[in-house]
Each structure stands twice: as C-alpha cells, then as structure tokens.
C-alpha cells in the first residue's frame, strides 16, 4: 500500500503514476517544401525539420516521411501553425468587376491516419477566404486541440497549396504534439 | 522497490514523478502600454498584469520587467494573443491607385532570451499584412506550441507596433506559460 | 517514506500525486445550432456534439445544456475554434462610397459561469473585423489559454452571430478543456 | 523619459508651406503613433493627423488635400508639411504620442502665424 | 465625423468641490472617451482614457463614467491646481474630434 499514499480515491488500476518528462513530445518546423505526388481528393503534406533548432523529438514520438507517429495511446494535444505568403489573385478584379465568385482560399488540416481504417480522419482544419486589395500578402492560421489516440497512429499537416507556404523561420510555420 | 509499481517501464531515474499542481505555470493579461525605448532591430516588449483578475504566476514561475521567469528545465506550453485595434491606413488607396507597395503589418513573436547567450531567440512569430477596406479594424494573432527551456530562460512578447494593442479586456490580449 | 521518493523536495503536502488518464477532459464538436433565446447583453450560446466522432468526455467533465461542468479544481487548458461563413455585408459598399462605419465583426468568447456569482466571467475573447471585398468569406477564430477553475464552474462558447457558424464539419468548429 | 519636442513654427505668408519637427525621445517611431493637433487662438483642439509605427498615416479628411505627415526613424523625428497656408491656419501645432486611441504624451506646441 | 459637445462651456467653484463635466458624442463610441487637461504654457496632459481608467500619476479625485454617447469627468474635491480646461476626444473613429472644452476657474 505504501506507493497507493499519494493516489487519489478515483486512482483507476490500469492508469499508472508516470514521470512527465518522460511522455511522448515533438515540435517540428518548416523546411522548404518540394513537389511531390500527392493522394487524390487530399491536399499535400508537409514534411518537416524534427531536430535542428527549437525541433525535437523524444520519448519514443518519432517523425518520418511526413508523418508523426504515435507511440503509445492516450490523449494527445496536437497543434500547428501555416503562415502563407501570396500575391492577390484575380479574386479582388473579379469582385470589384462586379462578378461574385468562389474566393480564394487557404486550408490546413491535421489529418489522422490509421492503418487499420482505409479513410484518413481529419481531426483539425483552419481555412480562410483570401481576397486581399493589396498586393502581396501574408497570415498565418493556427489549430490545436485535444484528441485520443492509438498507438500507431500517424498525424500529418496538409495544406490547400504548398506553393504559398512560408518556409523561411522556424516560428512562422509549425507543428506539434504531446501526450496529456 | 515498493514506491516504484506504479511507474511505467520505461520511466527515466531523472524524471521522478511530481504533483501536476506544483508545476511552475502563469497567465498573464493585458495592460495600457506606454512607449518605451527598445533595443534596435528588435520589435517592443509588452508589459503585462500578472496578479489580478484572471492573471497569476504560481510555483516559482515570476514575472519582472516585461519577462516570464523560467525557473526549472522542462518542456513548456508557451502561448499568447494580441488583438490588434487600427484605422486604416493609406495602404488600400496606394493599392487601389495601381502603386502595389510593402504591405502594413502587425506581428507577434514570443522571445526567449538567456543570459549566457547573445542573441535572443525567436520561439514563436505570428505576421499578417493589413490592408483593410472599412475605417476602424479589429483582429487577434493567436500563438501556442511547446518548447524545451531551461532555468533561468526568460520569455517575452513583442510586437511591431505598439499603439495598436488593444489593452481594453482582459482576454483579448494574454500571454502564458506553464510546464508540461 | 517509500512512496515519496520520487517526489521532488517542492512537493506540497496537499497536492497528491496523480494518474494523468484520470484527469477530466473533453473535447466537444460541432452541431447544427438552432435559434434558442439567449440573455440580453450577452450573445448567444453555442451547443456540442460531446460523444459522436472526435467528441468525448472522460472523468467526469460532463457537458449538458452548451455547458462543460468542471468537476475538480485545479488549472485547466481550455480551447475553441469557431469557424464562420458570411456573405459580404453592406459593409465594403458603404466604406467604398466613402462613408467610414462601424466594421461589422464576428466575435468568439469562452465564458465561466459560477453559480455563486451573480455576472458570468469572460475568460477569452476573438474579434474580428469583417469588411472583405468578395462575395462569400468563411475564416477561423481560435482561443486556447490556462485557467485556474472551481468545481461546480460553467464553461460555454458564445459568439456574436450564430447563424454565421460554420456547423458542416467536426474539424471546423470545436470547444475542449482538459485539466492540467 | 518620454519627450517630444516641436520646432519650425513662425510667421508664414499666405499661400505658403509650413514643415514643422517633433524631435522624440524615450521611445522608438518604429514601433509607436505620432498624432498631430493644433489649437487656434482661444479655441479648441483639432486633430490632423497620425503616422503610425508601421509608417501608415491617417489625415483628418478636410484638410488632408493640404497635408502630408513624414518621419525619419533614424533621427527619431516626425514632420508636418502643410501647404496653402491660409490665415485659419494660426495656431499652435502639438505633436502627441500613445495608444490607437488616445494621446498619452503631448509636446509644448509650437506658434503657427499666417499672415501679410 | 463625429461631434462631441461638453458642458458646460465654463464653470466657476471652490477648492473642495465636487465637479462634473459631460460629453455627448454624436453616435455611439464604444467607450473610447479620453478626457484631458490644458493649463497656460503647460503640455496638454492625459488624464483618463476608455471612459474610466485613470492614466499613470494622475490623483484619484479624478473619475469618470459613460457608455454609448454620454459620458462624465468627476473631480471629487476640487485641488487648486485643477483650474485648467478640459477637453473630451473620442478614440474610436477616425477623424479623432475634440469637445470644445471646460474652462474650469475658482469662484
């Protein structure tokens, strides 16, 4: 009973004490993206730096080929952030002409893919309507929440155009997670 | 042996458990800003409430001088938001009249800075060019991820301009720590 | 003295340890709102999908009536993201014939209910000025920041123009809160 | 401490321009508002004009044709050109510092006389 | 542009007096109501800004109160270096207009 004196009366047997430094952890930032094939009806990945600068990894949470993947179930606070940077497109023209259209727009979504289920499960997703006056411009879009997850699931972050995203600072462009 | 059955098998003999309660942690709210002189080439630092209201600082986690105190190594959540208040600027009509310039922006950056090391390092940065079309704008940059930082590291937020804070709540305008 | 072992010197005698999966934590999604009467002075209050797909609710945070009930004191994350969808106002046509007004805006805020005190208590606020040029706008307010709550506290999500939330997708549109 | 300072007011003719200065210190123009005000004799304030820290400037819209309002971060030093001056326009002219909303700090002022 | 009208235009009292000047703004500004001082040869000075709050280093005699369009500078106990006048400006649209002021002089 002597390690039980500290546990609360609602201390469930199967849920153990565990150290906090010891939880699965990555933050990854943004390295110029290349052209590469992507899923029909999905937008592209990102790949990502996990070990220069503020990027990390550690605990067993691994990064590899687009994908973070995750080492053992629990609750997991999963983030990111996409700064785009643009030139106007004929959005402003088209609408100042008096011809309403489908803007333009910018998405990110942090995806779950589960090997077992054929359909990756979208867990988060930022997007905005892009219509600037100004010439050239920028912004970021931020997500985070929390979600459970399976051991060996695989988080990536996907964007609507991987062209407009800004790779130049590690604190621009992110993404993360870390077990609750 | 007998303190040790609740710990999983991996745990690490230099990350003994703790009570999360006890874990450095703070939120910090905003205040009217006055002008300040700065270190050149880098952006303004905001002052901040760190005791009333919402606002508190808890197990050895400091505020002074515009800086959060880091005061044991560990891996933080770091977050902030600045609402940014404005009127429009010439940049629409500059745009409109055909003469595309730099865009107007506000920014944000989270900024770690450590004695032993000269420079100070960008943790988090949060850019949006302006170029609104109404008289009087109004929009927040929402910022969060997790970093690893070590005692005695200090936190900051600065932003591009400083009279365009909106000081006027509370919770428009934060900026907070705690570790994981 | 066993059990203590692990335990660092700062350990407060009154802060037991405890199991990380047995802490209270949700993470709700959205649903179609329907048009409910709401108290003056404050807008309107959103309400959650807490068990379908992405949603949960685990260790006794419940939600019921567009609250999260905080079950035990302690500092809590808590987050939301509200994405909005609009058609453009009269709002550009009247800057653009040269008539400055009001910017109509869209507004999130994460309010405490506490049923001791008589004013409920804003802990989080985005607002945006919504002046665009196009004909549809749709475009994401997210707000994540650490609380200290009460058991027996209210958390709900409150937003400027119901009819404008974007209610098609769970990624889209979320609220959570998990004890730290 | 915070300081601004005009200077370049006098006697000006009719039709001519004006440049006045307001020479800062304790703070960065990079990053704050400068505001530009002035007083008629034995009236109220009115507001000209603003320089923000990004360098965007806003113009009260009656007189913004006839204004333009510069600064030069380095020199830490903001400027009033104003032309086709015209007798109403005598007035002591304040150079103001502070948030989007308000004007925390304001220079002495500096005496604008247009006249033959 | 929005008008801002202060009364009264002038006013006489005693050290010790509790004073009240108002401000009505043409439509409603949101709270941005900042009210300042402006004695013979002195830099005008900030005195409260958003309604209420009151601006470093300045006493606490000084208060004020409003919403919407109307809005109020109480100085609880008149100090002989409070005759000055006082202006009200609105923050909340641009342009920035002023009231036309209170000159406020002992009895």
């Known amino acids: 009973l002597k390690g039980q004196e500290f546990a609360p009366s609602h201390q469930q047997v199967y849920a153990p004490l565990r150290a906090d430094g010891d939880k699965p952890r990555a933050h990854l930032t943004v390295v110029r993206q290349t052209p590469t094939q992507h899923l029909k009806n999905q937008f592209p990945a990102l790949h990502w730096e996990h070990e220069l600068g503020l990027a990390f990894t550690k605990n067993r949470m691994n990064y590899t080929n687009k994908f973070l993947l995750i080492p053992e179930s629990g609750d997991y606070f999963v983030y990111s952030q996409v700064t785009f940077r643009g030139m106007t497109s004929e959005c402003s023209e088209i609408r100042q002409a008096g011809r309403p259209n489908k803007p333009d727009s910018i998405t990110v979504v942090i995806t779950k893919v589960t090997d077992s289920y054929p359909e990756p499960t979208q867990l988060l997703m930022g997007t905005k309507s892009v219509c600037e006056v100004g010439s050239n411009w920028f912004q970021p879009i931020y997500l985070g929440a929390m979600f459970s997850l399976q051991e060996g699931d695989k988080l990536m972050v996907n964007v609507s155009d991987i062209s407009l995203v800004d790779y130049t600072k590690e604190d621009k462009t992110f993404f993360g997670a870390f077990l609750l | 042996l007998k303190g040790q059955e609740f710990a999983p098998s991996h745990q690490q003999v230099y990350a003994p458990l703790r009570a999360d309660g006890d874990k450095p942690r703070a939120h910090l709210t905003v205040v009217r800003q006055t002008p300040t002189q700065h270190l050149k080439n880098q952006f303004p630092a905001l002052h901040w409430e760190h005791e009333l209201g919402l606002a508190f600082t808890k197990n050895r986690m400091n505020y002074t001088n515009k800086f959060l105190l880091i005061p044991e190594s560990g891996d933080y959540f770091v977050y902030s938001q600045v609402t940014f208040r404005g009127m429009t600027s010439e940049c629409s009509e500059i745009r409109q009249a055909g003469r595309p310039n730099k865009p107007d922006s506000i920014t944000v950056v989270i900024t770690k800075v450590t004695d032993s090391y000269p420079e100070p390092t960008q943790l988090l940065m949060g850019t949006k060019s302006v170029c609104e079309v109404g008289s009087n704008w109004f929009q927040p940059i929402y910022l969060g991820a997790m970093f690893s930082l070590q005692e005695g590291d200090k936190l900051m937020v600065n932003v591009s301009d400083i009279s365009l804070v909106d000081y006027t709540k509370e919770d428009k305008t934060f900026f907070g720590a705690f570790l994981l | 003295l066993k059990g203590q072992e692990f335990a660092p010197s700062h350990q407060q005698v009154y802060a037991p340890l405890r199991a990380d999966g047995d802490k209270p934590r949700a993470h709700l999604t959205v649903v179609r709102q329907t048009p409910t009467q709401h108290l003056k002075n404050q807008f309107p209050a959103l309400h959650w999908e807490h068990e379908l797909g992405l949603a949960f609710t685990k260790n006794r945070m419940n939600y019921t009536n567009k609250f999260l009930l905080i079950p035990e004191s302690g500092d809590y994350f808590v987050y939301s993201q509200v994405t909005f969808r609009g058609m453009t106002s009269e709002c550009s046509e009247i800057r653009q014939a040269g008539r400055p007004n009001k910017p109509d805006s869209i507004t999130v805020v994460i309010t405490k209910v506490t049923d001791s005190y008589p004013e409920p208590t804003q802990l989080l606020m985005g607002t945006k000025s919504v002046c665009e040029v196009g004909s549809n706008w749709f475009q994401p307010i997210y707000l994540g920041a650490m609380f200290s709550l009460q058991e027996g506290d209210k958390l709900m999500v409150n937003v400027s123009d119901i009819s404008l939330v974007d209610y098609t997708k769970e990624d889209k549109t979320f609220f959570g809160a998990f004890l730290l | 401490e915070i300081q601004l300072v005009e200077s370049g007011g006098g006697l000006i003719q009719p039709g001519g321009s004006l440049r006045i200065s307001c020479a800062v210190s304790g703070f960065s123009l990079s990053s704050y508002g400068v505001d530009w005000v002035r007083q008629a004799p034995g009236k109220g304030l009115e507001w000209l004009g603003v320089i923000w820290g990004f360098g965007g400037t806003n113009y009260n819209s009656a007189l913004k044709s006839r204004l333009t309002i510069s600064k030069d971060n380095s020199k830490n030093t903001v400027y009033l050109q104003m032309n086709s001056l015209r007798a109403e326009d005598t007035a002591v002219y304040y150079c103001?510092?502070?948030?989007?909303?308000?004007?925390?700090?304001w220079g002495q002022g500096t005496l604008v006389t247009v006249s033959s | 542009d929005i008008q801002m009208t202060q009364s009264p235009s002038s006013l006489s009292a005693s050290v010790g007096d509790r004073v009240t000047i108002t401000c009505r703004a043409s439509q409603d500004i949101s709270n941005y109501l900042n009210w300042y001082q402006q004695k013979p040869g002195k830099a005008v000075k900030l005195l409260i800004y958003y309604t209420s709050r009151l601006h470093s280093g300045v006493p606490s005699r000084f208060s004020g109160s409003g919403s919407g369009t109307d809005y109020t500078l109480t100085i609880s106990s008149l100090q002989p270096e409070d005759f000055a006048t006082y202006f009200c400006q609105q923050g909340n649209t641009l342009p920035f207009t002023f009231g036309q002021g209170t000159k406020l002089e002992i009895k």
């Open positions: 103001a510092s502070g948030n989007f909303d308000a004007m925390d700090y």
